[in-house]
Amino acid sequence: IIGPGRGFGKRRHPKKLTPLAYKQFIPNVAEKTLGASGRYEGKITRNSERFKELTPNYNPDIIFKDEENTGADRLMTQRCKDKLNALAISVMNQWPGVKLRVTEGWDEDGHHSEESLHYEGRAVDITTSDRDRSKYGMLARLAVEAGFDWVYYESKAHIHCSVKAENSVAAKSGG
């Protein structure tokens, strides 16, 4: 007789998720290094050839702040969009009635630091729809689990997430 917790009768427990601490980033390397989101490839403007690399995200389960009233925050690379959509599901599962909220996506106004991945549509700043800061550490952890290549509990008011470039080998191989 196989005792409890052994053999085929073993129940798989869901992974215990630990919230990120304020100012923590995962992986524990600089954002624009190979082990994270990779190098900055250059600013994308509405007039540039690379603008077509950006795709709008109309996911109804995500709230976009769109403070510029231009729809810019909805624009992102496909990889960023995929990870964001995955995260939106996790957020609703984690906190019923709460949605993922994006405060910054692609930026064309120069509001970010030089060589920010926001200028390439590879970064988003996120909160929960209720703006409850006690949730942000766990939100960051969910972003890691959703597959963002670099997640940073950057501010008390948001989490910063970024992804590798579309043409990066690691991105294509799903690494």
Epitope: T103, R131, R133, K156
Partner: antibody, heavy 123, light 107 residues
Framework: EVQLVESGGGLVKPGGSLRLSCAAS????????MNWVRQAPGKGLEWVSS????????YYADSVKGRFTISRDNAKNSLYLQMNSLRAEDTAVYYC????????????????WGQGTTVTVSS | SYELTQPPSVSVSPGQTASITCSGD??????ICWYQQKPGQSPVLVIY???KRPSGIPERFSGSNSGNTATLTISGTQAMDEADYYC??????????FGGGTKLTVL
């Protein structure tokens, strides 16, 4: 030079009204959230009301809610505070102060203050 | 309503370090600003977002925020630092609130 100049203070009877103005100059007024903060004689600072830069958010302290109304005119670079049903406890110096945050996701503190205008509520 | 508590007064000798505390529930989830106000003058922002100094504010002013307590530290305190100091908290779901103020006396 970045400057905020308050006006409109004075002596008013309990139950009366006053309208304070704050004239801004030397910066892009529409890009900043604006605040009214008051200080009763010999007391500490008390936040009164805020008008966010996006014009989407207006906040009031519980002590003035329903009696005071904040407004702004970006074309005139001006902030206003309409004070109705004034009480003795509203007696204070009223300061206008700016902040570049939007009060929803960003807050940077009030980095420029006016010199204040005095409101006295007394019979 | 949310409350911030400061000691009414703090004394320090010239050249020594002054620490002014500000306490409130779950304060580390909020951003803290500190203001200096000298008699007859308007307040001046000396620290924002817990630890940042506006341009023109001397390096001897620093801030921290952990747990339920934020602290303004003035190292090498000078006579000109004698003033009232106010902490102020912000988060996206509560209005702005000021602490009661602390009178710093440089002995």
């Amino acid at each position: 030079e970045v400057q905020l100049v308050e006006s409109g203070g004075g002596l008013v009877k309990p139950g009366g009204s006053l309208r304070l103005s704050c004239a801004a100059s030397g910066f892009t007024f529409s890009s900043y959230s604006m605040n009214w903060v008051r200080q009763a004689p010999g007391k500490g600072l008390e936040w009164v009301s805020s008008f966010s830069s996006s014009s989407s958010y207006i906040y009031y302290a519980d002590s003035v809610k329903g009696r005071f109304t904040i407004s702004r005119d970006n074309a005139k670079n001006s902030l206003y505070l309409q004070m109705n049903s004034l009480r003795a406890e509203d007696t204070a110096v009223y300061y206008c102060a700016r902040d570049r945050g939007d009060y929803v996701d960003y807050y940077y503190g009030m980095d420029v203050w006016g010199q204040g205008t005095t409101v006295t509520v007394s019979s | 309503s949310y409350e911030l508590t400061q000691p009414p007064s703090v004394s320090v000798s010239p050249g020594q370090t002054a620490s002014i505390t500000c306490s409130g529930d779950k304060l580390d989830y909020k951003y803290i600003c500190w203001y200096q106000q000298k008699p007859g003058q308007s307040p001046v922002l000396v620290i924002y977002q817990d630890i940042k100094r506006p341009s023109g504010i001397p390096e001897r002013f620093s801030g921290s925020n952990s747990g339920n307590t934020a602290t303004l530290t003035i190292s090498g305190t000078q006579a000109m630092d004698e003033a009232d100091y106010y902490c102020q908290a912000w988060d996206s779901n509560t209005p702005l609130v000021f602490g009661g103020g602390t009178k710093l006396t440089v002995l």
